[in-house]
């Protein structure tokens, strides 16, 4: 590490003075930073002398030496008062400039130690300083200003007490940059547009800074805008505002808009969709199936997606039948606007009931006209079964009838014994009845089918069952003979 | 309607000034630039300069800045040019233009013709 | 500043027939930003103010008849009015809107016989 003759860590010196300062190191050793005209500087072997015959307070200030040969890197310092009576600053800087929460040295150097105890910091010509400035004070360095505020960027001076009056130093402007975080915030309105040719429109950009110095810019497709731009400063931020106000829109006038706001910390945009029309519009879809099919018992949510420009005066949900004159119950319908220019109207329709089942229709209306989309809803039921014993033209004939929706497909089994229901290990027989008659299908009603099974004598001790099923589910009846007859065969199939 | 309104017509001595106004209507007047346009007895049109109407940035052709003075007052949607130290040669027809967005002349005042005479 | 020359100064046509009329600027005037021209033509009747006729070189204002049609690019553009009424009598100005000053042309004056 350098040493530096004489020792310091401080000197005092009068105007007028020869000083020497030696830096003497195992190598060779420089002096850091400019060196100020009133110096000489020579070398004398591993040392470097640095020596004015005139010192004045301008050489008041830290002079450090270094060896740069010196793998650890050492210095050596001292600091250098030159106490001159009418001098008491020697200020290194005019202009400061930090950014915002950073500490701010304001390098004016005291030329007499003494002096320390009645030095202080003020704004240009006296002016205290604002509240909530906390600073401190070093002789070497001068005085920082903690964590300075944009507010704290002005002009200062530092003062001392020099038999009784206070001597100021020629001021310092202390420039207080605000942090851009990033790019200007921005806000682009509408999100979309929909006009009506001839129509007015209006589309607004505005930027919001926390410094004056950015620029906005509204763009159709690739066209920059030539726009008037609004100032204005509020919430601590700076804003600029450009409004695009159209008297009657053209088709020329749709297409794609972004506004564009760039600082030094980059660029930012956002876009959005200008439509003209030529004509209000109503369309009315739907995501799901038109025609719709649902267990009894079960909830179905009945949902139409609505787009138009101008808006909905009117909309509704209405039973068209075939059952009841009810109408669904306003609670149950539902409608969301997931933008500007599109909604979602949705009807519940929980626990369905059998006279719920028919002609659903969502109806709209705008200056575009009504619309309608109606919905077909028919309840699905498990078969419901039923059989007798009957004769048809002097034959024995058992008759199965089989009622829900789906249309029910019918099996005849014949089991052993006596039983409500043949299960697997007593079947005997199995007959299935490829076409069944159809006695009854409506719309939004079960299909009702009928199955005929002819016997002249059913035998005794066995059981016949009718089994009928579809996608809901099944149902069966078994009919147990009274008495036994002569074994038949049943008919072809 | 949109509509620019001009004052009438101005008869001025040599040296004086004068301040001709144009009152829009029919639209915002503080979303357009305006522009001045002069036209000497029938001959080619002339680009004065135009202004914002928020905050009174001018930007003037070099050939007449220190002669037109652009000024705006927003409250009554009404723009104006002073003209200063007229000569016979600012004799002409001033015409007051809004900049369309997307930056042609798209609606043009009547115009207001001056003479420079003793 | 950009000079806009037109030529010819002036033409007289009966009506029926097809006229072009030229305009050229000292530079270009394609707009890099969106590939337009900055270029736009008025119409001045007398004792009006001009009217605007067609911008960006080729686009035709709302409300002007299909029989004005605009062309060029770069430096060298066009106004042909396919089939001349008695009302087009008027002088024709072009204008670059490519960059201040804006300048106009020197106008052509069109007659009818």
């Known amino acids: 590490i350098p040493v530096i003759e004489p020792s310091g860590p401080e000197l005092v010196v009068k105007p007028g003075e020869t000083v020497t300062l030696r830096c003497v190191g195992n190598g060779s050793v420089e002096w850091d930073g400019p060196i100020s005209p009133h110096w000489t500087l020579y070398s004398d072997g591993p040392s470097s002398v640095l020596t004015t015959n005139n010192a004045t307070f301008q050489n008041t200030r830290t002079y450090r030496c270094t060896e740069p040969g010196d793998p650890l890197g050492g210095s050596a310092a001292i600091h250098l008062y030159v106490k001159d009576p009418a001098r008491p600053w020697n200020v290194l800087a005019k202009e400061v400039v930090v950014f915002e929460d950073q500490d701010a040295l304001l390098p004016c150097l005291l030329t007499d130690p003494v002096l320390e105890a009645g030095v202080s910091l003020v704004r240009l010509r006296g002016r205290p300083l604002l509240r909530h400035t906390n600073y401190s004070f070093s002789p070497w360095h001068g005085f920082i200003i903690h964590r300075a505020k944009f507010i704290q960027g002005q002009d200062y001076q530092c003062s001392a007490l020099m038999g009784g009056r206070k001597v100021m130093s020629i001021s310092i402007r202390l420039k207080v940059q605000k942090v851009i975080p990033g790019p200007p915030a921005l806000t682009l309105v509408p999100a979309e547009l929909v006009r009506i040719r001839g129509e007015a429109a209006q589309i607004v950009c505005s930027a919001s800074n926390i410094d004056v110095d950015f620029d906005v810019f509204l763009q159709h497709n690739t066209t920059k805008l030539a726009i008037p731009q609004r100032s204005d400063f509020h919430d601590n931020r700076y804003q600029k505002v450009l409004t695009l106000s159209l008297g009657q829109v053209d088709f020329q006038h749709a297409g794609n808009y972004s506004c564009v706001a760039s600082n030094v910390q980059g660029k930012h945009s956002t876009s959005m969709f200008f439509q003209v029309v030529e004509s209000a519009y109503l369309d009315l879809s739907s995501e799901q199936n038109l025609i719709q099919e649902v267990t009894v018992g079960e909830g179905l949510n009945l949902k139409v997606m609505v787009e138009a420009y101008p808006g909905l005066q009117g909309f509704n949900w209405t039973y068209l039948g075939p059952f009841s004159d009810h109408q669904p119950e306003p609670k149950l319908a539902n409608a969301t606007t997931k933008d500007t220019y599109r909604h979602t109207f949705t009807l519940s329709l929980p626990r369905l009931k059998p006279s719920e089942a028919g002609r659903y229709s969502f109806l709209a209306r705008n200056p575009g006209g009504w619309r309608a989309l109606t919905f077909e809803l028919t309840l699905r039921y498990p078969p419901e079964v039923s059989v007798i014993w009957t004769s048809i033209n002097g034959s024995g004939t058992l008759l199965c009838a089989a009622s829900g929706y789906p249309q029910p497909n019918v099996t005849w089994l014949q089991c052993a014994g006596h039983t409500d229901r043949c299960d697997e290990a007593q079947v005997l027989q199995v007959w299935v009845d490829p076409h069944p008659e159809v006695l009854s299908q409506e719309p939004f009603q079960k299909v009702t089918v009928q199955s005929l099974l002819t016997a002249e004598t059913l035998e005794h001790n066995q059981t016949y069952e009718c089994r009928a099923h579809n996608s809901v589910g099944s149902g069966s009846w078994a009919f147990i003979p009274i008495s036994a007859g002569a074994r038949t065969h049943p008919p072809d199939e | 309607e949109v509509q620019l309104q001009q004052s009438g017509p101005e008869l001025v001595k040599p040296g004086a000034s004068v301040k001709i106004s144009c009152k829009a209507s029919?639209?915002?007047?503080?979303?357009?630039?305006m522009n001045w346009v002069n036209q000497r007895h029938g001959e080619r049109l002339e680009w004065i300069g135009e202004?914002?109407?928020?905050?009174?940035?001018?930007s003037y052709n070099q050939k007449f800045k220190g002669k037109a003075t652009l000024t705006v007052d927003k409250s009554s949607s009404t723009a104006y040019m002073e003209l200063r130290s007229l000569t016979s040669e600012d004799s002409a027809v001033y015409y007051c233009a809004r900049r369309s967005p997307w930056w042609f002349f798209d609606v043009w005042g009547p115009g207001t013709t001056v003479i420079v005479s003793s | 500043d950009i000079v806009m020359t037109q030529s010819p100064s002036s033409l007289t046509v009966t009506a029926g027939e097809k006229v072009t009329m030229s305009c050229k600027s000292s530079?270009?005037?394609?707009?890099?930003?969106?590939?337009?021209?900055?270029l736009t033509w008025y119409q001045q009747k007398p004792g009006q103010p001009p009217k605007l006729l067609i911008y960006?070189?080729?686009t035709r204002e709302s409300g002007v008849p299909d029989r004005f049609t605009g062309s060029g690019s770069g430096t060298d553009f066009t106004l042909t009015i396919s089939s001349v009424q008695t009302e087009d009598l008027a002088v024709y100005y072009c204008?670059?809107?490519?960059?201040?000053?804006?300048?106009f042309g020197t106008g052509t004056k069109l007659e009818i016989k």
């Open positions: 204008q670059n809107d490519y960059t201040y000053p804006f300048t």
């Open positions: 960006w070189a080729s």
């Open positions: 029919g639209y915002t007047f503080s979303n357009y630039y």
């Open positions: 202004m914002n109407p928020n905050n009174g940035d001018s």
């Open positions: 530079q270009s005037l394609l707009n890099s930003g969106n590939q337009k021209n900055s």
